[in-house]
């Protein structure tokens, strides 16, 4: 009785179960009654990452420097190349096919989370008592200067974009 289903890592062909090729190898010829499945290793810059019956290996992804990409992890015969973005850029999608510059947090906003190769800068508004007077992809909101600890008084209150201005205690208004 010919089989209708095969074991794991096998496939059904011509009413018989043949072994799949292991990751990193492609199928050259199916097994027969008398011979095993014939597989060949993938060539340079090719890969197959599963047990398979593919007759052609996949090309490694190309990390195009013109798109701001660089190799994060070199591909093997069993794994694809992983691309990431150059410094100051991050991927536009999960598959990282191209890169865009990190955004800066505008004055009045600070960096909540610094960008990585795969995620953009996350900004947050500076709350009362904190300020940011720069556009930056790295700077957090900074606390207002404490005039009191310097034996000074506030001459001008701070805002989310400016620090307080301190002055001498005896200032006449």
């Amino acid at each position: 009785e010919p089989p209708t289903a095969c074991r794991e890592k096998q496939y059904l062909i011509n009413s018989q179960c043949c072994s799949l090729c292991q990751p990193g190898q492609k199928l050259v010829s199916d097994c027969t009654e008398f011979t095993e499945t014939e597989c060949l290793p993938c060539g340079e810059s090719e890969f197959l990452d599963t047990w398979n019956r593919e007759t052609r290996c996949h090309q490694h992804k190309y990390c195009d420097p013109n798109l701001g990409l660089r190799v994060q992890q070199k591909g093997t015969s069993e794994t694809d190349t992983i691309c990431t973005c150059e410094e100051g850029l991050h991927c536009t999608s999960e598959s990282c096919e191209s890169c865009v510059p990190h955004r800066s947090c505008l004055p009045g906003f600070g960096v909540k989370q610094i960008a990585t190769g795969v995620s953009d800068t996350i900004c947050e508004p500076c709350p009362v008592g904190f300020f940011s007077n720069v556009s930056s992809a790295f700077e957090k909101c900074r606390p207002w200067t404490s005039c009191e600890t310097k034996d000074l008084v506030v001459q001008q209150a701070g805002t989310n974009k400016t620090d307080v201005v301190c002055g001498p205690q005896d200032r006449q208004r």
């Epitope: 508004p125 709350p127 009362v128 008592g129 957090k140 009191e148 506030v154």
Partner: antibody, heavy 122, light 113 residues
């Protein structure tokens, strides 16, 4: 202890102005923000603006910008809130409250005045 | 401006009941640098000024009974009265102090059932 004592009730005509005072005691007046909040009958609390008496720095809610003036006299530890071009919708209880004390961590209002009822009626 | 939305607008309860009031902000009130939520809760009785109960979302103001507690983070906050007392029948307001202009919720009135 901290105390904020406000001026008495006022009845005003539409188009006129009102000036409410808030006398502070029991803390350093010049280094603590004074906040002004109003509450129309049956309405939500509405922040109007604030002043840091020692510097004269002010913040105003956009809704009241140009119509409200907040001032302070450090010699008498008194803050003032003047509202001009009064209309009937300005009928409300006006409160002063103490805000941050210069520590930059006490922005909530821990002490309030008793409130001043301003009635605008022709 | 940050909008503050309170619910419910009123609640009927009996002495001894557990009462929960919620407040939602239109943007996060949590600041990553100090991990503080810029939110306060006040109690107001008819004809009186509001009274501070809770600040930094969960810190109990000195002199306020421990049956009052605040919780939540980011945009969603809760004021809980664990066992309602006769003197707790009042209107409760949340307020943010993250950035100008400060804004309040429109209040939750706790009434006698």
């Amino acid at each position: 202890q901290v105390q904020l004592v406000q001026s008495g009730a006022e009845v005003k005509k539409p188009g006129s102005s009102v000036k409410v005072s808030c006398k502070a005691s029991g803390y350093t007046f010049s280094t603590s923000w004074i906040e002004w909040i109003r509450q129309a009958p049956g309405q939500c609390l509405e922040w109007m603006g604030s002043i840091l008496p020692g510097s004269g720095s002010t913040n105003y809610a956009q809704k009241f910008q140009g119509r409200v003036t907040i001032t302070a006299d450090t010699s008498t530890s008194t803050a003032y809130m003047e509202l001009s071009s009064l209309r009937s919708e300005d009928t409300a209880v006006y409160y002063c409250a103490r805000g941050d004390d210069g520590s930059y961590v006490r922005w909530y209002f821990d002490h309030w005045g008793q409130g001043t009822l301003v009635t605008v009626s022709s | 401006d940050i909008q503050m939305t309170q619910s419910p607008s009123s609640v009927s309860a009996s002495v001894g009941d557990r009462v929960t009031i919620t407040c939602r902000a239109s943007q996060s009130l949590l600041f990553s640098v100090n991990q503080k939520n810029y939110l306060a809760w006040y109690q107001q009785k008819p004809g009186k000024a509001p009274k501070l109960l809770i600040y930094w979302a969960s810190s109990l103001q000195s002199g306020v009974p421990s049956r009052f507690s605040g919780s939540g983070s980011g945009t969603d906050f809760t004021l809980t009265i664990s066992s309602l007392q006769p003197e707790d029948f009042a209107t409760y307001y949340c307020q943010h102090y993250y950035s100008y202009p400060w804004t309040f919720g429109c209040g939750t009135k706790v009434e006698i059932k």
